[in-house]
């Protein structure tokens, strides 16, 4: 008799999830000498322990505490790049500007990037059929709680000047409901963070508007200023040229505005 299984609105666990997490861990620890001490089997056990046999709408930050402890990694606090709705460009940037870090450049972020996972209450099975959707089902699901936990801690670690890349092509350039807007902004520590500098990335080639004047950016400035952190904003009119100039800053065309 087939066992009844909860049907959620979101996609199920990414296929070969355990193998993927373990392989990513091994790869990351091989590439990053400072993380060579990490035992990837223990990391997987801690990851699994956070959600296996638990109701996938009842996950807490505490469930991920053992994983957070095993994944402890000192990130240079003044080299943090946050992003919202423009992940690919942020990652392309840190691949070139190797001394800066997005969350996905850390072990924990790298392990989980683009993956989905959930379990079932009272069984040791991973649910490959469906997982809770944040909107349609519940917010305290394994994936959302993981990203909320690591994002909060990543923001808490930041100091001096923190950069954030924002997507200027979206109707809400700054979205209060994004992870950046709902978690990271509120967990920057004013005792350590002097300035949040937003880089607004333009989409259209002929778009010469000053998107730093956008109402949502003004809203971000207001939130940040109320937290006693300074705010600055730059337009990145040509993201392709921006990346090229990060790669080759001596290029003669890189002195003009990008």
């Amino acid at each position: 008799v087939p066992r009844w299984r909860q049907q959620w609105s979101g996609p199920g666990t990414t296929k070969r999830f355990p193998e993927t997490v373990l392989a990513r861990c091994v790869k990351y620890t091989e590439i990053h000498p400072e993380m060579r001490h990490v035992d990837c089997q223990s990391v997987w056990d801690a990851f699994k322990g956070a959600f296996i046999s638990k109701h996938p709408c009842n996950i807490t930050e505490e469930d991920y505490q053992p994983l957070m402890k095993l994944g402890t990694q000192t990130v240079p606090c003044n080299k943090i790049l946050l992003w919202s709705r423009i992940k690919d460009l942020a990652h392309q940037f840190t691949q070139v500007q190797r001394d800066m870090f997005t969350l996905e450049d850390t072990l924990l972020g790298y392990l989980a990037d683009d993956l989905t996972w959930c379990g079932e209450f009272n069984t040791s099975k991973i649910n490959y059929q469906s997982c809770p959707d944040w909107r349609k089902d519940c917010s305290n699901n394994p994936v959302s709680v993981f990203w909320k936990t690591v994002s909060r801690r990543f923001a808490e670690a930041a100091c001096d000047v923190v950069h954030v890349m924002l997507n200027g092509s979206r109707s809400k350039i700054f979205d209060k409901n994004s992870t950046f807007g709902s978690v990271e902004v509120h967990n920057l520590q004013p005792e350590k963070v002097q300035t949040l500098e937003a880089w607004v990335i333009h989409g259209g080639r002929e778009d010469s508007r000053d998107l730093c004047q956008d109402p949502t950016i003004k809203e971000l400035e207001s939130i940040i200023s109320k937290r006693n952190i300074q705010f600055s904003c730059k337009n990145i009119y040509r993201p392709d040229k921006f990346l090229q100039c990060v790669k080759n800053p001596e290029d003669s065309s890189c002195t003009s505005e990008i």
Partner: nanobody
Framework: QVKLEESGGGLVQPGESLRLSCSAS???????????MSWYRQGPGKQRELVAS???????TYADSVKGRFTISRDNAKNTAYLQMDSLKPEDTAVYYC??????????WGQGTQVTVSS
Amino acid sequence: QVKLEESGGGLVQPGESLRLSCSASGSIFKVFRVFAMSWYRQGPGKQRELVASISSGETTTYADSVKGRFTISRDNAKNTAYLQMDSLKPEDTAVYYCNADHTFTGDFWGQGTQVTVSS
């Protein structure tokens, strides 16, 4: 310079109490409240084991062997964590270590303080 300093250890009789303190100093602890604070212990000839921890959100966890006897707490204004140890037993004899951990800032340890429970 980062420093975690334990104090409050000593020699007591079974059934008595001790209160350990862990004071954090150095620029890394400018925002002490974001660190999870833990107490570990290492008894003679034993592995280091977690005794108690308190998260930045003040959630506490305890080893089964100390539940109901030990209480962990923190004072963020003083950059200090505490371990109140009541009804001490001879098997609580160990060097007690303080640990401060933040996922993206680092994992820091004190030098340890000796607790001996003996009649």
